[in-house]
């Protein structure tokens, strides 16, 4: 067990703050909730506290939640290559680039850290050449989300991990929305982190309404599991 | 454009596509007698590139997002330089995310003919 992962035993309030600007609509999203890496449960809720928000909320989904990826839960065999984790309490920086197909982009950074028991995703999104009718800006998404795998690797040059998904957003026209995830995490401290075998996160997430909540929000219930590493041949003999 | 050995060159060239559709941009020379090649890629997510071994310490690849445009600086020329310049943009093949050498290249530039004399 990492030293960090032992901070992940029991239920961790999470706290998230974004503040975005996409095509210079500016907006901000406070997020308060909790999670459960025995579990890899997530239970969130997001208001937007300016007012209403510019984007669809579930283009943000990846940037809240995807966000805290500490909370995945690594079966035993797959411990040994969870990043995320390792890098508590210190935590880690998460740089994403988000395209959207035939339409504008997503920039985001985020420190992910402990503050006191609280773990904390503060992020910064910078949103440029969107359509002003587009998908996003049009508000065309269906507020839901579809299941996705998120495919890691270790990035030994910068003592961290890649990641690359690819996000099918469903449109009210019974389209789809491709958006693709190129993500890099880099430890803030200077302690020991797991790098890595190639595997991906298997992820389940549903978003609801709080039917006494008149601010525009977002109810998040998500579950992340790791897996695409096998048990190796001493496991099998045992 | 034409330069002498140990002059410098700056190519640019602008895509239309969208940022999905050209997550890597890169520059390709065909010069005499050989088959195209891969002079330097750029990964547009964060600026990750690649450099031919004859062109490492020479040549530098960048891009500017908001205009949609690749650059490549080229210094201390040499003959065997010479070439037409071709620039391309695409995505990464399936499996390879982070990998623009070997992208599948959609749009390809018209060229431009870089001379180096002696």
């Known amino acids: 067990m990492s030293k960090g992962e032992e901070l992940f035993t029991g239920v961790v309030p999470i706290l998230v703050e974004l503040d975005g600007d996409v095509n210079g609509h500016k907006f901000s999203v406070s997020g308060e909730g909790e999670g459960d890496a025995t579990y890899g449960k997530l239970t969130l809720k997001f208001i937007c506290t300016t007012g209403k928000l510019p984007v669809p909320w579930p283009t943000l989904v990846t940037t809240f939640s995807y966000g805290v990826q500490c909370f995945s839960r690594y079966p035993d065999h797959m411990k040994q290559h969870d990043f995320f984790k390792s890098a508590m309490p210190e935590g880690y920086v998460q740089e994403r680039t988000i395209f959207f197909k035939d339409d504008g982009n997503y920039k985001t950074r985020a420190e992910v850290k402990f503050e006191g028991d609280t773990l904390v995703n503060r992020i910064e999104l910078k949103g440029i050449d969107f359509k002003e009718d587009g998908n996003i800006l049009g508000h065309k998404l269906e507020y839901n989300y579809n299941s996705h795998n998120v495919y890691i690797m270790a990035d030994k040059q910068k003592n961290g991990i890649k990641v690359n998904f690819k996000i099918r957003h469903n449109i009210e026209d019974g389209s789809v929305q491709l958006a693709d995830h190129y993500q890099q995490n880099t430890p803030i401290g200077d302690g020991p982190v797991l790098l890595p075998d190639n595997h991906y996160l298997s992820t389940q997430s549903a978003l609801s309404k709080d039917p006494n909540e008149k601010r525009d929000h977002m109810v998040l219930l998500e579950f992340v599991t790791a897996a695409g590493i096998t048990h190796g041949m001493d496991e099998l003999y045992k | 454009g034409s330069v002498q050995t140990g002059g410098s060159l700056g190519l640019s060239c602008t895509t239309s596509?969208?940022?999905?559709?050209?997550?890597?941009m890169g520059w390709f020379r065909q010069t005499p007698g050989k088959e195209r090649e891969g002079v330097a890629t750029?990964?547009?997510?964060?600026?990750?590139?690649y450099y031919a071994d004859s062109v490492k310490g020479r040549f530098t690849i960048s891009e500017d997002s908001a205009k949609n445009t690749v650059y490549l600086r080229m210094n201390s020329l040499k003959p065997e330089d010479t070439g037409m310049y071709y620039c391309?943009?695409?995505?990464?093949?399936?499996?390879?995310?982070?990998?623009?050498?070997?992208?599948?290249?959609?749009?390809w530039g018209q060229g431009t003919q870089v001379t180096v004399s002696s």
């Open positions: 596509l969208d940022g999905y559709s050209s997550v890597c």
């Open positions: 750029i990964h547009r997510a964060f600026g990750d590139t």
């Open positions: 391309a943009a695409g995505r990464p093949k399936s499996g390879s995310a982070w990998n623009c050498r070997d992208a599948e290249y959609v749009y």
